[in-house]
């Protein structure tokens, strides 16, 4: 009886030969658990795991932590692979981080993380950046040194205010801080003034909502 | 001390245009947002619009869009605010004050002593 | 935009009198809300933000609660500096609002 081959990430999945975009079965190595994620590869060199996407507003990003935790949405289309999954993987080796953003008048931009990973579960599962590069800003819209993780019902941010709640999504938040690009997705004309959109304040500021996000990794020596 | 000084009443006949500056000090003037609000004569108080100096992004109240523009120069820690097309009912105290966040438009902590703009014919 | 109705519009206390304020939005604006007040012919000088943190060096005889529609800024004992006219705010969402104000006045 054949071996059953699994992949922890899109970057195994590319090595094995399946270099086409889409969508993919996942599974941490001593575990049964599997995640679909997609794969996208082709951009710079392939083997990228989206952990994260926003497009049009189809899905709801106003989720509780246990929501966070497992993911939720269409991983080929809006969605938030799940904490857990990220938090251990990102845990195994170390990973890029590259966040890939769209305005409404046609601009793209990115940032560009050389180190990633979330801490535990028990730690809120607190976000650890270092050396960023990228056009998105010269300053990291993930505020430095990281936070915890709040959802609508797990408050764990710097703020009085509960951000989560406030600004709508799970995200890092500071007090509320530069960026959240889990906000509320407002269309287009409607996009701008908005306190609780799609934030990436050294790009856009912080009245504006974006157009896409895509929220990616890839072990450090692809 | 922190500290937000406004220019000097100014009269104005109707469609004319009017500048007010705000000039900062104490602070780090591209560390907050700065913020317009105006009074007029014994009423209460209204949000016109912010500016961002460190990006020079702004946000206007809709009721004042295509009238207002707010500026900044941070060689000089100043916000200017011009409004345009000035109505009689636009006669009121103009002021600017210093939001506590750079990243959101939340409450506001330092104001200006304010500017009379009269708009008379 | 979010209405904030503020009520009353005037009110007439003593010195060492309990006064409260109160302010009442449209719609949920969590606790995005602070409190100011103005003197005549000066500008506005925060007392209150996030519904209930006190700014600093503001006397603990002001308070503020309240969260989703309905708040209170309550000023336990009147002094003769505190008459003036007090404005809520909500910073919820754009455009932020302001109350009508609330005259404190001497009896």
């Known amino acids: 009886k054949g071996e059953q081959i699994s992949f922890r990430d899109c970057a195994e999945v590319f090595k094995s030969g399946h270099t086409t975009n889409g969508v993919y079965t996942l599974t941490l190595p001593n575990s049964t658990e599997e995640v679909k994620a997609y794969c996208d590869m082709e951009a710079g060199g392939g083997g990228w795991t989206i952990i994260q996407r926003r497009e049009d507003g189809s899905v709801d990003f106003q989720r509780t932590w246990k929501e966070y935790k497992v993911g939720f949405g269409n991983p080929s289309g809006e969605y938030w692979l799940g904490n857990e999954f990220v938090s251990q993987l990102t845990n195994q080796q170390r990973y890029v981080l590259k966040i890939h953003l769209k305005d409404w008048e046609g601009n793209e931009a990115y940032s560009l993380y050389e180190h990633f990973y979330l801490s535990s579960e028990e730690l809120n599962y607190r976000i650890h950046l270092k050396g960023l590069t990228g056009t998105a800003g010269k300053i990291s819209s993930i505020s430095q040194p990281g936070n915890d993780f709040s959802t609508k019902d797990a408050d764990n941010d710097k703020c009085i205010c509960k951000c989560s709640q406030m600004l709508t999504g799970g995200w890092w938040f500071d007090a509320c801080g530069p960026s959240n690009l889990n906000g509320m997705y407002y269309p287009q004309r409607q996009n701008t003034n908005k306190f609780n959109g799609i934030k990436w304040y050294y790009w856009k500021g912080s009245g504006y909502s974006l157009k896409g996000t895509t929220m990616m990794i890839r072990p450090a020596g692809f | 001390q922190v500290q937000l000084v406004q220019s000097g009443a100014e009269v104005k006949k109707p469609g004319a245009s009017v500048k007010v500056s705000c000039k900062a000090s104490?602070?780090?003037?591209?560390?907050?947002?700065m913020v317009w609000v105006r009074q007029a004569p014994g009423q209460g108080l209204e949000w016109m619009g912010y500016?961002?100096?460190?990006?020079?992004?702004?946000g206007y109240n809709q009721k004042f869009e295509g009238r207002v523009t707010m500026t900044t120069d941070t060689s000089t820690s100043t916000a200017y605010m011009e409004l345009r097309s000035l109505r009689s009912d636009d006669t009121a105290v103009y002021y600017c004050?210093?939001?506590?966040?750079?990243?959101?438009?939340?409450?506001?902590?330092?104001w200006g002593q304010g500017t009379l703009v009269t708009v008379s014919s | 935009d979010i209405q904030m109705t503020q009520s009353p519009s005037s009110v007439s206390a003593s010195v060492g009198d309990r006064v409260t304020i109160t302010c009442k939005a449209s719609?949920?604006?969590?606790?995005?809300v602070a409190w100011y007040q103005q003197k005549p012919g000066k500008a506005p000088k925060l007392l209150i933000y996030?519904?209930?943190t006190r700014d600093t060096g503001v006397p603990s005889r002001f308070s503020g609660s309240g969260s989703g529609t309905d708040f209170t800024l309550t000023i336990s004992s009147l002094q003769p500096e505190d008459f003036a006219t007090y404005y809520c705010?909500?910073?919820?969402?754009?455009?932020?609002?302001f109350g009508g104000g609330t005259k404190v006045e001497i009896k």
């Open positions: 004050a210093r939001t506590r966040d750079r990243y959101d438009v939340w409450y506001f902590d330092v």
């Open positions: 104490g602070y780090s003037f591209t560390d907050y947002n």
């Open positions: 500016i961002d100096p460190y990006n020079g992004g702004t």
């Open positions: 719609q949920d604006v969590y606790i995005a």
């Open positions: 996030w519904a209930s």
């Open positions: 705010h909500q910073y919820s969402s754009y455009p932020p609002t």
